[in-house]
């Protein structure tokens, strides 16, 4: 009677271990007198010849499918060979593909790192992950790896990254797409510019000055604060587009430095100061404004 190769489990799933046991026929003497070797498709496995009749393959992959057998060699160099056993490694198709973001919720500040994490709930073997952008499905990146998650990184997010994204996972059983994820790029305010508008070239006490503050860039809403010598005059909100204005009735005390600040919750930016001076021309009863 020949050797017997026992495979456990007989129908392994990818990524799981398999135990091979080379069983001696009962009429043979003790295993201790033998050296054992396991083979797949004419290739020796593991350590080659060994005194152990057992071999564990820690992770079986689809490409490990094949014809397995074992051999035993006596002290007298007589070689016994088992029948071949066909081992077919079962691949689990990918399922439940999802796309998540870091930071969570799909909101990222301009300039910050954005990571799109593609995950599968199940699936074995080499999984190919693909990331797509926008309705037209522009392929951003493709990665093949033996893991249930893969990442696509945008090191510094820009407005052009504010789009819809999805990913696709595939391991030989057809592509499986995730749902769409919308990315919002939040833009901190740029440094605003303060403009002073007077009703005439030389404003006088009693005139109404219009202070207009405008940041070129920044996600809305933007709150604008107006300052005279670092004292708050007032504030105004711009819910969408454009800047904000503040009306000021001139008095003699209104000479000095003016500035404004823009804040949209992502940080505040202060404008350069604008200096407004009142001069009292000789014999004149009114103060004039120059900037």
């Amino acid at each position: 009677a020949g050797l017997l190769l026992i495979v456990s489990p007989s129908h392994p799933t990818e990524g799981s271990p398999v135990n091979l046991t080379c069983k001696m026929p009962s009429l043979q003497s003790s295993d201790a007198q033998f050296q054992f070797c396991f083979f797949r498709d004419d290739q020796a496995l593991g350590p080659g010849w060994s005194s152990s009749p057992k071999l564990q393959i820690a992770n079986m992959w689809k490409e490990d499918s094949g014809s397995y057998w074992c051999e035993a060699q006596t002290m007298a160099s007589k070689v016994l060979r088992s029948w071949r056993s066909q081992i077919n490694v079962h691949r689990v198709p990918v399922a439940d593909v999802s796309l998540e973001t870091q930071p969570p919720g799909g909101q990222v500040m301009e300039g910050d790192r954005l990571v799109l994490i593609c995950s599968v709930a199940m699936g074995t073997g080499d999984i190919t992950f693909l990331w797509y952008k926008g309705a037209i499905g522009l392929n951003l990146q493709t990665k093949t790896q033996r893991s249930l998650t893969a990442e696509y990184e945008i090191p510094t997010a820009r407005e052009s990254d504010a789009e819809q994204y999805y990913c696709v996972a595939e391991n030989g059983y057809g592509p499986r797409p995730s749902g769409l994820v919308s990315i919002t790029v939040r833009i901190p305010v740029s440094r605003p510019i303060l403009m002073v508008r007077a009703p005439r070239a030389q404003a006088v006490v009693g005139d109404v000055l219009k202070l207009h503050c405008e940041a070129l860039r920044g996600s809305h809403p933007i709150l604008y604060w107006f300052y005279h010598e670092d004292v708050i005059l007032g504030s105004s909100s711009a819910p969408s587009g454009g800047g904000a204005s503040f009306n000021l009735s001139l008095t003699a005390e209104h000479s000095g430095n003016y500035s404004c600040e823009a804040n949209n919750g992502l940080g505040a930016q202060r404008s350069e100061e604008v200096t407004l001076n009142f001069t009292v021309p000789t014999g004149a009863r009114s103060n004039h404004l120059t900037s």
Partner: antibody, heavy 119, light 112 residues
């Protein structure tokens, strides 16, 4: 493929008017702020006007040198950007570029259209 | 306005040489919100439109060769070309977008 194609530049007399156009394709035009940037012959680059997206109320911004003379506008349905220029001066002579604003830097430029203001 | 000063105004180089050019701003371009420097570099070849090379002072635009490197922070910035190629002969502009945009006067790169 992203394309920005300007047109409308020509020789105009001082105090005259002209409208420049820019036809855009290859990206979602209505989500981006757009600029007109100019370059006088042998000189550097100068921003002229900016218009934000509909989400931002089509807010417009102008360089001091063109304020109250130039008007920037857009037609998202046609993916078109415009620059209406009135009361033109000789110093407005330049190559005018239609440009996409991507987080403050300018990642796509048209080939430019030439405006010459001369009597 | 934020003033951008570029130096040198022109530079004669040989193919294969390493080149550095400077850009200085009149105010810091480092944004407190995200610690990014709001500065870009452009290349303009004769008779062509400008082309974005670098944004946020050091991020290379897609498709730009890795011989182009941007560095610096605050008010002092540098564009380095590690090994100049014939096709790099152009004028290079820096631009700030911390506030209303302003450009430097440019650095013209010529062959020796």
């Amino acid at each position: 493929e992203v394309r920005l194609v300007e047109s409308g530049g020509r020789l105009v007399q001082p105090k005259g008017s002209l409208r420049l156009s820019c036809a855009v394709s290859g990206f979602t035009f209505n989500t981006y702020a757009m600029y007109w940037i100019r370059q006088a012959p042998g000189k550097g680059l100068e921003w002229v006007a900016r218009i934000r997206s509909k989400t931002n109320n089509f807010a417009t911004y102008y360089a001091d040198s063109v304020k109250d003379r130039f008007t920037i506008s857009r037609d998202d349905s046609q993916s078109m950007l415009y620059l209406q220029m009135n009361n033109l001066k000789t110093e407005d002579t330049a190559m005018y570029y239609c440009v996409r604003d991507n987080s403050g830097s300018f990642d796509y430029w048209g080939q430019g259209t030439t405006l010459t203001v001369s009597s | 306005d934020i003033v951008m000063a570029q130096s040198p105004s022109s530079l004669a180089v040989s193919v294969g040489e390493k080149v550095t050019m400077s850009c200085k701003s009149s105010q810091s371009l480092l944004h407190s919100s995200n610690q990014k420097n709001y500065l870009a570099w452009y290349q303009q070849k004769p008779g062509q439109s400008p082309n974005l090379l670098i944004y946020w002072a050091s991020s290379r635009e897609s498709g730009v060769p890795d011989r182009f490197t941007g560095s610096g922070s605050g008010t002092d910035f540098t564009l380095t070309i590690s090994s100049v190629q014939a096709e790099d002969l152009a004028t290079y502009y820096c631009q700030q977008y911390y506030s209303y945009p302003t450009f430097g006067a440019g650095t013209k790169l010529d062959l020796k």
